[in-house]
Interface confidence: low
C-alpha cells in the first residue's frame, strides 16, 4: 500500500501557502484528486510529488494515491483544506444527475473544518428544503440527499455560518430522473363494444407512467382522433385519459379502436372492436347435440351460449314434458358471463330419474324478442326381461318380453340342468332373434320387444333362458319346466310360477 507524506489524514493550510504531497510505493504510483489549478506533478519511479506554491480554496479536496501494479488495489488518501475566510465552499460540480431512489451527492467541499458545526443545505433564494428531504453532510465530500425523489429536482446552495452570517456556495442543480421501467401502462375500456345505431357510446383510453413525458392517442381504423386529454397525477404516476363520447353512433363509428402510448422506452398499443348494429339481437346456440342420451341415474349438464345486445331482460329453463309437470329447480340453473355480450347458461341435472326424461327448453328475452333452444333428453336403461309359457295356435311357446333403451337384442339359450343362469359349459343350444317384435316405442320411454320361442316338447331337466342386452347392460330370465307346469327364474330375485 502506498504511503503519503505528510502522514496525516487531513491538512489545513491558508491561501497562498506552499503544499507538497509526496507518495511512495513499491512500484510506480499515481495521484488522483479534484480538478484544480496550480498543481505541479513530479514523478520519480516509485515516488510522486504533487506540489503548489500558491494554494487556493479550489485546491480543497481529497487526494488519493494509488499503485496501479498492486494486485490488491491499495490506496492512501489525504484531505486538504485551504481555509479561505471569503470562500467557505469549493463546489466541484454545478449539475448533479441521478435516478430516483439513488443518493445524490452535492459536491460542495468545506474549506475550513472548523465551520462544520454551522453548515446547512438550502434551496436557492433561501427557500427551505422540501419536507421529507433526508440528507447528511461530510466536510470531505459535501451534502448527500438520500434516496432522491423526482420532486427534489431543484437548485441548491450550501450554507456556512461565518462570523454570525450565512455564506452561500454557488448553486448546484440537481436533476432526479424517473426510472422508467418501460412504455406507459395502458387501458382501453370497454374491451368490446356493441351499440344499436343512434345510441350513445363511450370509449376510454388511458395511459400512465412514472414520468410525465409520454404521449397517448386514440386511433379509429388508423385515423388518429382529436380528443381533449385529461391529465392527473396520483399514486406517484402521471395519468393521461382520452374519453371518446358518441351521442348517436352510426355505422361509420364502428371498427377497430387502438389506444397507443409511447415514451423514450418504446410504444404500447391495445385494441378493441366496436360493432354498430341496426337492431337488437339475441342468438342462442349450444356446443352440445340438442338430442341427448344419458343412462338413468347419471347426471347431465345442459349448456346454452347466448349472444345478445342489449342485455337479457329475462331467461329461464322450462321442462316441456312428457312426464311430470315438474320444472327444473332454480338452484340447478347457473349463469356465467364470458364477456359483456356473451353468456353461458347451464342446467345441472344430477342423478336422472325416469320421470326427468323429455324436452328441456332454455328461453331468453331482450328488446329483440324471445328465443328458445330445446334439448331432447332420452334416458338409457338396461334391459328388464320376463318369460312366460303359453300356447299360440296350439303350439307351446316361450314368450320373452324385454324392455330397455336403446332397443334390446334378444338371445335364447337352452342348457342342461336347472339353473338361474346358463353358463357356457351347460349350453346345449343358442338362438339369436335378430328381429324381435316391437311392442312399444314412444319417445323418451323404454322400448319393449317380444321374442317367441316355439318349443314342441319341454325337456324337464333343462333350463330355457332369455337374455337381452343393449349398450347399457343386459338382463335375463330363466324358465325351468317342472312336471306340474313350469317354473320361471328371474335372476336372483323371485320365483314365479304361472
Amino acid at each position: 500500500i502506498p504511503v503519503i507524506e505528510p502522514s496525516v489524514p487531513e491538512l489545513v493550510v491558508k491561501p497562498g501557502a506552499t503544499v507538497t504531497l509526496r507518495c511512495v510505493g513499491n512500484g510506480s504510483v499515481e495521484w488522483d484528486g479534484p480538478p484544480s489549478p496550480h498543481w505541479t506533478l513530479y514523478s520519480d519511479g516509485s515516488s510522486s510529488i504533487l506540489s503548489t506554491n500558491n494554494a487556493t480554496f479550489q485546491n480543497t479536496g481529497t487526494y488519493r494515491c494509488t499503485e496501479p501494479g498492486d494486485p490488491l488495489g491499495g490506496s492512501a488518501a489525504i484531505h486538504l483544506y485551504v481555509k479561505d475566510p471569503a470562500r467557505p465552499w469549493n463546489v466541484l460540480a454545478q449539475e448533479v444527475v441521478v435516478f430516483e431512489d439513488q443518493d445524490a451527492l452535492l459536491p460542495c467541499l468545506l474549506t475550513d473544518p472548523v465551520l462544520e458545526a454551522g453548515v446547512s443545505l438550502v434551496r436557492v433564494r433561501g427557500r427551505p428544503l422540501m419536507r421529507h428531504t433526508n440528507y447528511s453532510f461530510s466536510p470531505w465530500h459535501g451534502f448527500t440527499i438520500h434516496r432522491a425523489k423526482f420532486i427534489q429536482s431543484q437548485d441548491y446552495q450550501c450554507s456556512a455560518l461565518m462570523g454570525g452570517r450565512k455564506v452561500m456556495s454557488i448553486s448546484i442543480r440537481l436533476k432526479v430522473q424517473k426510472v422508467i421501467p418501460g412504455p406507459p401502462a395502458l387501458t382501453l375500456v370497454p374491451a368490446e363494444l356493441v351499440r344499436i345505431r343512434g345510441e350513445a357510446a363511450q370509449i376510454v383510453c388511458s395511459a400512465s407512467s412514472v414520468d410525465v413525458n409520454f404521449d397517448v392517442f386514440l386511433q379509429h381504423n388508423n385515423t388518429k382522433l382529436a380528443i381533449p386529454q385529461q391529465s392527473d397525477f396520483h399514486n406517484n404516476r402521471y395519468q393521461k385519459v382520452l374519453t371518446l363520447n358518441l351521442d348517436q353512433v352510426d355505422f361509420q363509428h364502428a371498427g377497430n379502436y387502438s389506444c397507443v402510448a409511447s415514451n423514450v422506452q418504446g410504444k404500447h398499443s391495445t385494441s378493441m372492436f366496436f360493432r354498430v348494429v341496426e337492431s337488437a339481437y339475441l342468438n342462442l346456440s349450444s356446443e352440445q347435440n340438442l338430442i341427448q342420451e344419458v343412462t338413468v341415474g347419471e347426471g347431465l349438464n345442459l349448456k346454452v351460449m347466448v349472444e345478445a345486445y342489449p342485455g337479457l331482460q329475462g331467461f329461464n329453463w322450462t321442462y316441456l314434458g312428457p312426464f311430470s309437470d315438474h320444472q327444473p329447480e332454480p338452484k340447478l340453473a347457473n349463469a356465467t358471463t364470458k364477456d359483456t355480450y356473451r353468456h353461458t347458461f347451464t342446467l345441472s341435472l344430477p342423478r336422472l330419474k325416469p320421470s326427468e326424461a323429455g324436452r328441456y327448453s332454455f328461453l331468453a328475452r331482450n328488446p329483440g324478442g324471445w328465443r328458445a333452444l330445446t334439448f331432447e333428453l332420452t334416458l338409457r336403461y338396461p334391459p328388464e326381461v320376463s318369460v312366460i309359457w303359453t300356447f299360440i295356435n296350439g303350439s307351446g311357446t316361450l314368450l320373452c318380453a324385454a324392455s330397455g333403451y336403446p332397443q334390446p337384442n334378444v338371445t335364447w339359450l337352452q342348457c342342461s340342468g336347472h339353473t338361474d343362469r346358463c353358463d357356457e359349459a351347460q349350453v346345449l343350444q343358442v338362438w339369436d332373434d335378430p328381429y324381435p317384435e316391437v311392442l312399444s316405442q314412444e319417445p323418451f320411454h323404454k322400448v319393449t320387444v317380444q321374442s317367441l320361442l316355439t318349443v314342441e316338447t319341454l325337456e324337464h331337466n333343462q333350463t330355457y333362458e332369455c337374455r337381452a342386452h343393449n349398450s347399457v347392460g343386459s338382463g335375463s330370465w330363466a324358465f325351468i319346466p317342472i312336471s306340474a307346469g313350469a317354473h320361471t327364474h328371474p335372476p336372483d330375485e323371485f320365483l314365479f310360477t304361472p
Epitope: T223, L225, I227, P228, N245, L246, D247
Partner: antibody
Amino acid sequence: QVQLVESGGGLVRPGGSLRLSCAASEFTFDDYAMSWVRQAPGKGLEWVSAISWNGGSTNYADSVKGRFTISRDNAKNSLYLQMNSLRAEDTALYYCASTVEVAHRRLYKYLEVWGQGTLVTVSS
Amino acid sequence: QAGLTQPPSVSVAPGQTARITCGGNNIGSKSVHWYQQKPGQAPVLVVYGDSDRPSGIPERFSGSNSGNTATLTISRVEAGDEADYYCQVWDISSDHVVFGGGTQLTVL
C-alpha cells in the same frame, strides 16, 4: 400564451383569389382540428371550413364549397385558406380557430382559441 | 341542417341576471356552446358542452339545454359583460359548425 395570427387579407376584385394564412404558437398544433369562421361587417359569425388534425378530412359551408380550399402544414404550425372566384358577399373579417372535436356526453365540436382576424374585401 | 334562433337584443340592469336563449328543433339532443364578442375583438368561448366553463371564465356565466331551447345565464351582470353573444352547435349529419344569429346584450 396560446396564439393564432391570421394574415393574407386585403382588397381583391370579384373573381380574384387570395390565400389566407394562420400561424399557431404555444400549443400542440397537430393535436387540433382547425376552422375558418368569417364575419361580414355588422353581421354575425358564419362558419366557413374545417380540417382534421392531420388534414385527412376537410369540409366546407355550402356557400364556399368548390371555391375555397382549406389545408394545413403541421411542420410549420400553419393553417391556410385558398379562396378562388371571390364574390362581393365573401367580404368579411376571417378568423382561424382551434377546434376541439369530441368531448364528454356527446360528440360535438367547438372553437376554443380564436385569432384576431384578417379582413378580406371583395370589391370592383 | 340545424337553424339556431337567438333574440336580437337583451337588456339588463347591472347586478341583475341576464338570460339569452338559443332555439332549435330538439336542440336538447345536441351540445351547445356560447361565445362572447366585444366590439372590435375576436369571439371568446364562455361556455361549452351546454354548461362547462373554460378556465378563466367567471362562475357568473352558466348554461343549460333541454327540449328546444338552450339558455346562457349571466348572473350579477357587470358593465364589462356588454357584448354580442353567439350560440353554436355541431350538425352531425352535415359535419358543419352552425352559429346562431347573435344577441346583443346591453347593460343599462
